[in-house]
């Protein structure tokens, strides 16, 4: 069963390589366990950036070595991706799955284009 997922079209990463965006889903049912996956699409290839499953009322926890962090509030997930460099510029797609209770629902956003600009190196000072 399909579900609508909304996310911003464009986000500019900070000079420290951090990008944040909100992923919002229109829950058709009473979701109590949700899985959020961030996918990166570049050059027609899709790779998984990070994923987390959380129970409503519990913290959104990614794996320890994940470049993602996040918080949830109602039907919104605030995602932050760290350690980005210019080569990581691309379309970041938010995929939301309502895992429990049944029935299972899947929603995929249109993607957020994240632009990452590497900071200019500081000029040498004599």
């Amino acid at each position: 069963k399909a579900m609508h997922v909304a996310q911003p079209a464009v986000v500019l990463a900070s000079s420290r390589g951090i990008a944040s965006f909100v992923c919002e889903y229109a829950s058709p049912g009473k979701a109590t366990e949700v899985r959020v996956t961030v996918l990166r699409q570049a050059d027609s290839q899709v790779t998984e950036v990070c994923a987390a499953t959380y129970m409503m009322g519990n913290e959104l926890t990614f794996l320890d070595d994940s470049i993602c962090t996040g918080t949830s509030s109602g039907n919104q997930v605030n995602l932050t991706i760290q350690g980005l460099r210019a080569m990581d510029t691309g379309l970041y797609i938010c995929k939301v799955e309502l895992m429990y209770p049944p029935p299972y629902y899947l929603g995929i956003g249109n993607g957020t284009q994240i632009y990452v600009i590497d900071p200019e190196p500081c000029p040498d000072s004599d």
Partner: antibody
């Protein structure tokens, strides 16, 4: 090891209420949903409902809606089911069971069951 | 509600012989995500139910590999390749494709 220990057998009068407890140990209580299941004497299993220990959110079988109240006390890792306006056909064994996401939300650990007898 | 129907009601088996239990659902349990939301539980005499199989064909931890399960969207079979005395009890199929979760009526396996 994971354990769900339920309160003892109850004999109650028709029209009264009963509250059954289910104490969890051996895992982080707030990481798993708790389900409640009814088993009529010598018969099959019937799902009553579930509860999310994090926020107390519940899902219920409409058949029990309004009579079964599911709650938790996270400070003592205990789930409760209160059944009100008891009738003779509520005489059954009631189980609590933990859901496991790795098993696609199957019930992987069950309590030992609590026999409720409704009799005047 | 999805109705789960099991057969036979009772199954007498000789130890070492195979056994087969059928379960039919009133609606396909195969979701478009590729997962079949069918489970098998065993309730041994005087005990609580225990999980045997999840997602139609996956054995839960600690379940002997003499148990197997297969099926389509609506018709499922639990097989025991060689029945042992410890396998006696009531076998239930269940679905969690939709709420309310529902169980089959059970099949009682007994030793001849």
């Amino acid at each position: 090891q994971v354990q769900l220990v339920q309160s003892g057998a109850e004999v109650v009068k028709p029209g009264a209420s009963v509250k059954i407890s289910c104490k969890a140990s051996g895992y982080k209580f707030t990481d798993h949903f708790i389900n409640w299941v009814k088993q009529n004497p010598g018969q099959g299993l019937e799902w009553i409902g579930d509860i999310n220990p994090n926020n107390g959110g519940t899902n219920s079988n409409q058949k029990f809606e309004g009579r079964a109240t599911l709650t938790v006390d996270t400070s003592i890792s205990t789930a409760y089911m209160e059944l009100s306006r008891l009738r003779s056909d509520d005489t059954a064994v009631y189980y609590c069971a933990r859901l496991r996401r790795e098993y696609f939300y199957a019930m992987d650990y069950w309590g030992q069951g609590t026999l409720v007898t409704v009799s005047s | 509600d999805i109705v789960m129907t099991q057969s036979p009601l009772s199954l007498p088996v000789t130890p070492g012989e195979p056994a087969s239990i059928s379960c039919r659902s009133s609606k396909s349990l195969l979701h478009s995500n590729g997962i079949t939301y069918l489970y098998w539980y065993l309730q041994k005499p005087g005990q609580s139910p225990q999980l045997l199989i999840y997602q139609m064909s996956n054995l839960a931890s600690g379940v002997p590999d003499r148990f197997s399960s297969s099926g389509s969207g609506t018709d499922f079979t639990l097989k025991i390749s060689r029945v042992e005395a410890e396998d006696v009890g009531v076998y239930y199929c269940a679905q969690n494709l939709e709420l309310p979760l529902t169980f089959g009526g059970g099949t009682k396996l007994e030793i001849k």
